[in-house]
């Protein structure tokens, strides 16, 4: 059974009184409709809450919305609907919050049918004041901020025009027509696809990919026969139709589309798809869908140029295009990812990698759990994690797995223990070492969140009945205390805490359980008095990440280096604080074969660290397209894993010979590229 509230748990002294003094209720004078909540800036305490209520009239639906603002992390709210002239805000666009601490907010308003364009409300002072601006177009998408300059906005119109503003939405200019998809790149660059004939849908596979680096003064066509494109890390990907048939291939660029290389990935047919699962500046995880409606595909991991790919995981669960995958980046430990595979018997199993996709294994069975009915052997089974797919299947899973970069090693997830994911009611499990070992933390489904960089974990039971109790733990989920935050239970709708897990405030949202009228209500609990003092040096202990065998000289080495972290001791009840920075100390490891991926045309047999030639490619020269030229690859089968920092030790060398031949792919030969200026 899970650890809980027993006499052996270290109880936090006088916590009821401390929390009661720090529990703040706010009842919103709105009928129950929908509510959306956004944090404005980092560590500002500013929260915007938009409530919307649809009143069905005879012919149409009348919408009413209210806007509230808090500047103390949700303890108090002020109705600021008058700042937006009591206008109905379109919730499908959400609240567009500016990057970093710009303090910028854009709300998109609903306007009457006959108007020339839409309307936005803009704030650049953390929603203290708003300016109404009428648009010369009707927006199709939310306003998108340039990551580099929050004054630069782009939006698509319902007429497929690409509109740009250089003064935070004050003035807008249509820079291109017939646009399907637009994205900001780095350095205020905009990438977008255009159609020539009928529409985005009709021209799919015949779109052009354009780039502007000066907000629409000049353009460059950087791709033709485009199906779609995506950005990930420093990579620009385009899915391009093949010349002769209906298949398409991925091309990749690392120079904003000036030069392209064909990715060594399988081509896909009309019914298949590619998906960038994760990307950073070193590499990318790419999912390639299997032919037919299988619901699975293959994960490939790239080299540092995004060109050469290694097969990472077979039978990776990913339902049809735009569907669900359980692929999760465990942000609390470098190199760790969790996902699901679809077994031959159609059961779903969880797999984990600790080395960025090099090897995948099952999750170790929690010591305090028994194998369930899915297990053939009652002593041998694994933990299986519920993520997006389970949620989409309406299983009793209120939340996806949770990890935070500043709560080192902590992963919280719903799961079941057996040979595969079970449809039975799940429990909540925690790992404090990035997924190597797990413990049952709470019985039954819960909502959970991490506060104070892991110093506090808060949970609320998932129930159809009204609730009034919150649980919290100050020792990474080993022991739990319960706190009754209100006498009158509420229908719970969500837990909200400031993104980044640095806050000590949690807001419990719901609506009153009264028979006649239902109103939105929030309870904000500040845990600062539970963690009475600031943590000191003595409150931390040293932890070696990825440690599996202390007797191994290279214990803890992942991607060529090991990292030791200062971590809060489980018994320490103190504040990490808002300014907490993870203290870590890296040390470089000697290279071994584990630091190299198998090159194109090579693979690793199971339980072997050596790369061997794929039989069907034995003796062939490997040709691939690089920067518009055909290359000749002479290889001994190994290449360094992107981001691997090892030195010395084993060093298999690879060599690429340039034959200076023209590339067989006619995608974007230099003469096909064209530029134009407005």
């Amino acid at each position: 059974s899970a650890p809980g509230e027993d006499e052996e748990c270290g109880r936090v002294r006088d916590f009821v009184a401390k929390l009661a003094n720090n529990t703040h209720q706010h009842v919103f004078d709105d009928l129950r409709g929908s509510v959306s909540l956004s944090w404005v800036g980092d560590s500002t305490g500013v929260i915007l809450v938009l409530t919307t209520f649809h009143v069905p009239l005879v012919i149409m639906t009348f919408g009413q919305s209210k806007l509230y603002r808090s500047e103390d992390y949700g303890k108090n709210f002020k109705d600021i609907t008058d700042l937006i002239n009591n206008t109905f805000i379109r919730t499908e666009f959400g609240m567009a919050i500016g990057p970093e601490n710009s303090g910028k907010v854009v709300l998109t308003a609903e306007v009457s049918g006959g108007s020339r364009g839409g309307r936005i409300f803009r704030s650049s002072d953390f929603a203290k004041n708003f300016v109404q601006t009428d648009l010369p177009f009707h927006p199709l998408t939310q306003m998108m901020y340039s990551p580099q300059n929050s004054d630069y906005l782009l939006a698509l119109s319902t007429e497929n025009g690409l509109w740009v503003s250089k003064n935070f939405g004050g003035k807008w200019e249509e820079i291109h027509k017939a646009v399907c998809l637009a994205k900001w790149g780095s350095d205020n660059t905009i990438f977008f696809t255009t159609y020539a004939n009928g529409s985005c849908k009709a021209d799919l596979g015949a779109l052009e990919l354009w780039r502007t680096s000066d907000l629409g003064k000049s353009f460059k066509t950087i791709g033709v026969k485009i199906y779609s494109f995506g950005l990930g890390g420093r990579f620009l990907f385009a899915s391009v139709m093949a010349d002769k048939d209906t298949t398409r291939r991925i091309h990749v660029s690392t120079d904003q589309g000036d030069t392209w290389s064909m990715a060594q990935l399988p081509s896909v047919g009309q019914e298949q798809f590619y998906s960038i699962l994760a990307a950073n500046d070193d590499m990318v995880f790419m999912h390639v869908d299997e032919p037919g409606d299988t619901g699975f595909g293959t994960i490939f991991t790239s080299d540092d140029r995004g060109i050469v790919y290694s097969k990472s995981l077979d039978r990776h669960l990913y339902t049809t295009t735009g569907g669900e995958t359980d692929f999760t980046n465990v942000t609390s430990l470098r190199g760790v990812y969790i996902t699901s595979v679809l077994s031959e018997d159609n059961s779903i199993q969880t797999m984990i990698t600790f080395d960025q996709g090099g090897r995948w294994t099952h999750l170790r069975k929690p010591e305090n759990s028994e194998c369930d009915a899915t297990a053939k052997n009652k002593n041998e089974c694994s933990l299986h994690i519920h993520a997006s797919y389970s949620i989409s299947q309406k299983l009793n899973v209120p939340m996806a797995p949770l990890s935070e970069p500043n709560a080192v090693g902590i992963v919280i997830a719903h799961g079941s223990v057996g040979d595969a994911i079970s449809v039975m009611v799940p429990d909540v499990y925690i790992s404090d070492d990035g997924g190597y070992s797990w413990t049952k933390m709470l019985e039954g489904p819960h909502y959970y969140t991490i506060l104070d960089s892991g110093g506090i974990i808060v949970a609320i039971e998932h129930s159809s009945r009204p609730i009034n109790v919150i649980k919290f733990s100050t020792d990474e989920g080993q022991c739990w205390q319960t706190y009754t935050f209100t006498r009158d239970p509420i229908y719970f709708t969500g837990l909200a805490s400031e993104p980044g897990a640095r806050s000590m405030n949690i807001s419990i949202w719901g609506f009153t359980a009264s028979f006649l009228t239902s109103q939105w209500v929030s309870y904000t609990i500040d845990f600062k008095d539970i963690l009475e003092r600031n943590c000191e040096e003595k409150d931390y202990t040293i932890w070696l990440a990825h440690s599996t065998d202390p007797e191994d000289y290279e214990d803890g080495c992942i991607l060529g280096y090991k990292e030791q972290f200062l971590r809060l001791r489980k018994s320490s009840v103190c504040q990490n604080g808002r300014d907490y920075v993870v203290t870590k100390q890296p040390s470089i490891c000697l290279c071994s074969l584990e630091d190299f991926l198998c090159d194109f045309g090579y693979y690793r047999p199971e339980n072997d660290s050596k790369c061997v030639e794929q039989p069907e490619l034995k003796g062939h020269d490997l040709e691939f397209c690089l920067y518009g030229r055909e290359e000749h690859l002479t290889t001994n089968g190994y290449r360094k894993i992107p981001g691997d920092k090892c030195q010395g030790g084993v060093n298999p060398v690879r060599e690429v010979k340039d034959l200076k031949k023209k590339c067989t792919s006619n995608f974007l030969s230099p003469e096909k590229q064209n530029s134009k200026s407005n």
Partner: antibody, heavy 124, light 106 residues
Framework: QVQLVQSGAEVKKPGSSVKVSCKAS????????ISWVRQAPGQGLEWMGG????????NYAQKFQGRVTITADESTSTAYMELSSLRSEDTAVYYC?????????????????WGQGTTVTVSS | DIQMTQSPSTLSASVGDRVTITCRAS??????LAWYQQKPGKAPKLLIY???SLESGVPSRFSGSGSGTEFTLTISSLQPDDFATYYC????????FGGGTKVEIK
């Protein structure tokens, strides 16, 4: 089999310093923390501090902070404990001990290998 | 720092007796507790780690239990070789030892 061999007995004057060494053999020295524990005549055990050879991360018991320095030399698999401003109450047997480790936590699993002890006598 | 209180400080027992030594932490230390045996003139020897895990090579008559703040070392049937001083040690704060329990012949 891992062994910890400590330097020989020392007699010191009050106010001076003593440096005790602890050499490891037969194991992966770098991957374990080494703690120093002392025991005054007829008294119990008292932890002074510890070090992790990789990166040389040392931490000390509050009582000895500022007076004790623990270091490690990975190349010779040796840990050192230096205690300064000696007084008569520092007369004790000083042990080095390897912190057992089953996970990434260096100090949580007890001290599984001990040195033979070094007697330090502080007397004027 | 976390204080460890061991009791009793001295315990008289005979061969074959079941012996129980307790250790109390001033705050919760989860299961991060170790037990040692020390004989005169010798270095301590690890018996139990993580409150209840038996160190390899230690006879199974030694067992540990408890978590949080209350811990127990039990010797199910005292043997002549077991007369010694026993120490508990917590590892979830800066390491601290209990005062010791001397098990002597009755």
């Amino acid at each position: 089999q891992v062994q910890l061999v400590q330097s020989g007995a020392e007699v010191k004057k009050p106010g001076s310093s003593v440096k005790v060494s602890c050499k490891a053999s037969g194991g992966t020295f770098r991957n374990y923390a080494i703690s120093w524990v002392r025991q005054a005549p007829g008294q119990g055990l008292e932890w002074m501090g510890g070090i992790i050879p990789i990166g040389g991360w040392a931490n000390y018991a509050q009582k000895f902070q500022g007076r004790v320095t623990i270091t490690a030399d990975e190349s010779t698999s040796t840990a050192y404990m230096e205690l300064s401003s000696l007084r008569s109450e520092d007369t004790a047997v000083y042990y080095c001990a390897r912190q057992g480790r089953k996970t990434g936590y260096y100090y949580y699993y007890g001290m599984d290998v001990w040195g033979q002890g070094t007697t330090v006598t502080v007397s004027s | 720092d976390i204080q460890m209180t061991q009791s009793p400080s001295t315990l008289s027992a005979s061969v074959g007796d079941r012996v129980t030594i307790t250790c109390r932490a001033s705050q919760s230390i989860s299961s991060w507790l170790a037990w040692y045996q020390q004989k005169p003139g010798k270095a301590p020897k690890l018996l139990i780690y993580k409150a209840s895990s038996l160190e390899s090579g230690v006879p199974s008559r030694f067992s540990g239990s408890g978590s949080g703040t209350e811990f127990t070392l039990t010797i199910s049937s005292l043997q002549p070789d077991d007369f010694a001083t026993y120490y508990c040690q917590q590892a979830d704060g800066h390491i601290t030892f209990g005062g010791g329990t001397k098990v002597e012949i009755k």
